[in-house]
């Protein structure tokens, strides 16, 4: 089987959601889990991580053969200590397969605007907390 | 045993919002998809959307996306429904039911006995 | 969205008659269809799952069949209690949609 796990990020508002977007199989999804860590080159480990999230095992209709689990971590309003690397990773309790989706950093500026980058669907996205737009 | 108790009858205004909620009792609510259904006096059944609690991932029909918000609490194994802006067309029976696990099951296997919402002036 | 037309709307049988009840997907649905039943006053039951999958407790007089776009769910000799009203939904792509129903009502 073939499961795909990309990182993305939205904002609402003063929000910042780090999303992580996990492509698998029906049958694929028993067992495996995808986490959020944060500065853990090494060590990523769903015990270590900012939050899991059990994979989808319905897609809730009949006539599809992929499912899309995602989670969602939430940062109500981006401080200095958020700044930091970031990556999406998926593992399987049964098979111990594992897999590492791309970094990603939050760079929090002086002016009290935040960047993140590393982004593979938008290479580099620039947040400003007094206008809440991206730019 | 699997259970899905709704919040009792409502009686709102035209322009108002109702929220019912549906508890769940006798499973793993968040491996699930809940589906919410109504039935208006003499009709049949129409489906509203429905939300996987697992990750809040939730599916609506185009008729009721904007004014329908369907969410759950995992730590209470509680999905809720609301509707905003409410119009008598909206007077009927709202309805959660649990989609059992696809191949599987698939269908609806379980439902709430019904919250009845009036929406009159 | 896949539409959903069950026929006829209204079944006039007597106990112990066969009732066959008629289900049509506006584009093919696999085996992606269930059907219920729904009584007065209560909410609806799953009869069957998958177009002809029996569901436990369910009387074995109780049927479906059918695949792609026409579906059939039959009652072998009706019950008394069978009068009722039944739909059949589908699950195979958003939006989920129901029939319309087919009343069983006694002759």
């Known amino acids: 089987g073939c499961i795909n796990i990309t990182s993305s990020a939205s904002q609402e508002g003063t929000r910042l959601n780090l999303i992580c977007t996990v492509w698998h199989k029906k049958e694929e999804a028993e067992g495996f889990v995808v986490f959020l860590c944060k500065d853990r080159s090494g060590d990523c480990s769903p015990e270590t991580s900012l939050k899991q999230l059990r994979l989808k095992r319905d897609p809730g209709i009949d006539g599809v053969g992929e499912i899309s689990s995602q989670l969602m971590f939430t940062i109500s309003q981006v401080t200095p200590l958020h700044s930091g690397t970031y990556q999406c990773c998926a593992r399987s309790q049964k098979s111990g397969i594992r897999l590492q989706g791309h970094f990603f950093s939050i760079l929090f500026t002086e002016t009290g605007n935040y960047t993140v980058t590393g982004l593979k669907q938008r290479q580099h996205l620039e947040f400003s907390h007094n206008e809440g737009t991206l730019s | 045993q699997v259970q899905l108790v709704q919040s009792g009858a409502e009686v709102k205004k035209p322009g108002a919002s109702v929220k019912v909620s549906c508890k769940a009792s006798g499973y793993t609510f968040s491996d699930y998809w809940m589906q919410w259904i109504r039935q208006a006096p003499g009709q049949g059944l129409e489906w509203i959307g429905a939300i996987y609690p697992g990750d809040d991932d939730a599916r609506y029909t185009q008729k009721f996306r904007g004014r329908a918000t369907l969410t759950a609490d995992k730590s209470t194994s509680t999905a809720y429904m609301e509707l905003s802006s409410l119009r008598s067309e909206d007077t009927a029976v709202y309805y959660c039911a649990r989609r059992g696990i696809a191949a599987v099951v698939g269908g609806f296997d379980y439902w709430g006995q019904g919250t009845t919402l009036t929406v009159s002036s | 969205e896949i539409v959903l037309t069950q026929s006829p709307a209204t079944l006039s049988l007597s106990p112990g008659e066969r009732a066959t009840l008629s289900c049509r997907a506006s584009?093919?649905?696999?085996?992606?269809l269930h059907w219920y039943q729904q009584k007065p006053g209560q909410a609806p039951r799953l009869l069957i799952k998958?177009?002809?999958q029996s569901i436990s407790g369910i009387p074995a007089r109780f049927s479906g069949s059918g695949s792609g776009t026409d579906f059939t769910l039959t009652i072998s000799s009706l019950e008394p209690e069978d009068f009722a009203v039944y739909f059949c939904?589908?699950?195979?792509?958003?939006?989920?949609?129901f029939g319309g129903g087919t009343k069983v009502e006694i002759k």
């Open positions: 939904q589908q699950s195979n792509s958003w939006p989920l949609t």
């Open positions: 584009q093919s649905i696999s085996n992606h």
């Open positions: 998958y177009a002809s």
